[in-house]
Interface confidence: low
Amino acid sequence: HTAAQDNCTCPTNKMTVCSPDGPGGRCQCRALGSGMAVDCSTLTSKCLLLKARMSAPKNARTLVRPSEHALVDNDGLYDPDCDPEGRFKARQCNQTSVCWCVNSVGVRRTDKGDLSLRCDELVRTHHILIDLRHRPTAGAFNHSDLDAELRRLFRERYRLHPKFVAAVHYEQPTIQIELRQNTSQKAAGDVDIGDAAYYFERDIKGESLFQGRGGLDLRVRGEPLQVERTLIYYLDEIPPKFSMKRLT
């Protein structure tokens, strides 16, 4: 089933309106903001989630990038245009006709322009680096235990196939999770790494998108893993196109 039958809710997305109006009285859910039907058996796309959240306050993040082509989401929240499948449209424009190109996770990858700006294709983000700093603990976590726990989390909570968790690096207090997913690797039904990363980001911030599953309680061998800082870097299959002015 696509949504919880007993009280007609969407387990994977609380930013929905649900009603038992499907075939045979089946519970069906639509995303707030867009009204698009969502599959409650999997993660909702980041685009539809951002659309539902468009009135939330802006949150900007900046830190040194790990490579010249990595992107950080410094623009924060915006009301995106999503395609009929719920993916980001390659070109996004605001109400003042300022436009820019985004990647598959909705992060700007070009300078801002006007309505004449062309974004020929939605460029896929194939590598996501999630950089975490955990709060001080009595000692360092065991690397292999940490690795196993984070892989389990992405598999069980976010339904991301284990093959897409490329590596877990640990140098106390910094944890780095690498997600990799090329266009050719992603099969129908596979959770997108961008969506998994977004759900994880919201969980870490205590803003869980799951309905009635409680917040994220991360433990490694029973020891709570409390994150005090998160930064996410996005690498695209085609490098971004910014002017030199922005890079200085």
Epitope: D21, G22, Q28, S34, M36, A37, P84, E85, K89, L115
Partner: antibody, heavy 121, light 107 residues
């Protein structure tokens, strides 16, 4: 490839009803809405209504309310348009067309071939 | 209801010409306008959606622009297969409404 195949032409008498079918293939039926548009001979396009195939909820244009019923059978990926109390002015080609579910996506990217409905005594 | 007014209603042009068709909405529809091409006896075909997004497989000579109430479809260099009727449609709010059509004929 994505296709919408409609039922054949119909000739009806005034006061009768007609039911036009539209079978979808090449995509997951419930991921897109189904719209109905008609075109009288030599005239422009007129929107009649649509159905959210995921929820099964239809929405009708005011001019057709009470006379039109749009439905969908997800098991056969088929949408239906039923128009009752037919008048000669209802003579037109009736098209089904695919759209997204949300308001940003109510443009029609795939169309059926059209079904000519002739109302004549 | 939102009225969509197209101009001109008919237009004669030659192969190679640059042609512009305009569509005016009776109220603000953001960028939610689509353009279709229809040939006799055939279903319409989507050319442009969301005012300026060219649909898959549509030749680059077709472009759309505009926001708010004023929209334009431009064919940069007319080809023989472009002679047809063109419709604009607002996909901002129901009831969805179309322009009355522009018939593009060979001069």
């Amino acid at each position: 490839q994505v296709q919408l195949v409609q039922s054949g032409a119909e000739v009806k008498k005034p006061g009768a009803s007609v039911k036009v079918s539209c079978k979808a293939s090449g995509y997951t039926f419930t991921t897109a809405g189904m719209q109905w548009v008609r075109q009288a001979p030599g005239q422009g396009l007129e929107w009649m209504g649509w159905i959210n195939t995921h929820s099964g909820v239809p929405k009708y244009a005011e001019d057709f309310k009470g006379r039109v019923t749009i439905s969908a059978d997800t098991s056969t990926s088929t949408a239906y348009l039923q128009l009752s109390s037919l008048k000669s002015e209802d003579t037109a080609v009736y098209y089904c067309a695919r759209s997204g579910h949300g308001s940003s996506y109510w443009y029609f990217d795939v169309w059926g071939q059209g079904t000519l409905v002739t109302v004549s005594s | 209801d939102i009225q969509m007014t197209q101009s001109p209603s008919s237009l004669s042009a030659s192969v190679g010409d640059r042609v512009t068709i305009t569509c005016k909405a009776s109220q603000d529809v953001s960028t939610a306008v689509a353009w279709y091409q229809q040939k006799p006896g055939k279903a319409p075909k989507l050319l442009i959606y969301s005012a300026s997004h060219r649909y898959t497989g549509v030749p680059s000579r077709f472009s759309g622009s505009g926001s708010g109430t004023d929209f334009t479809l431009t064919i940069s260099s007319l080809q023989p297969e472009d002679f047809a009727v063109y419709y604009c449609q607002q996909h901002y709010i129901t009831p969805l409404t179309f322009g009355q059509g522009t018939k593009l004929e060979i001069k």
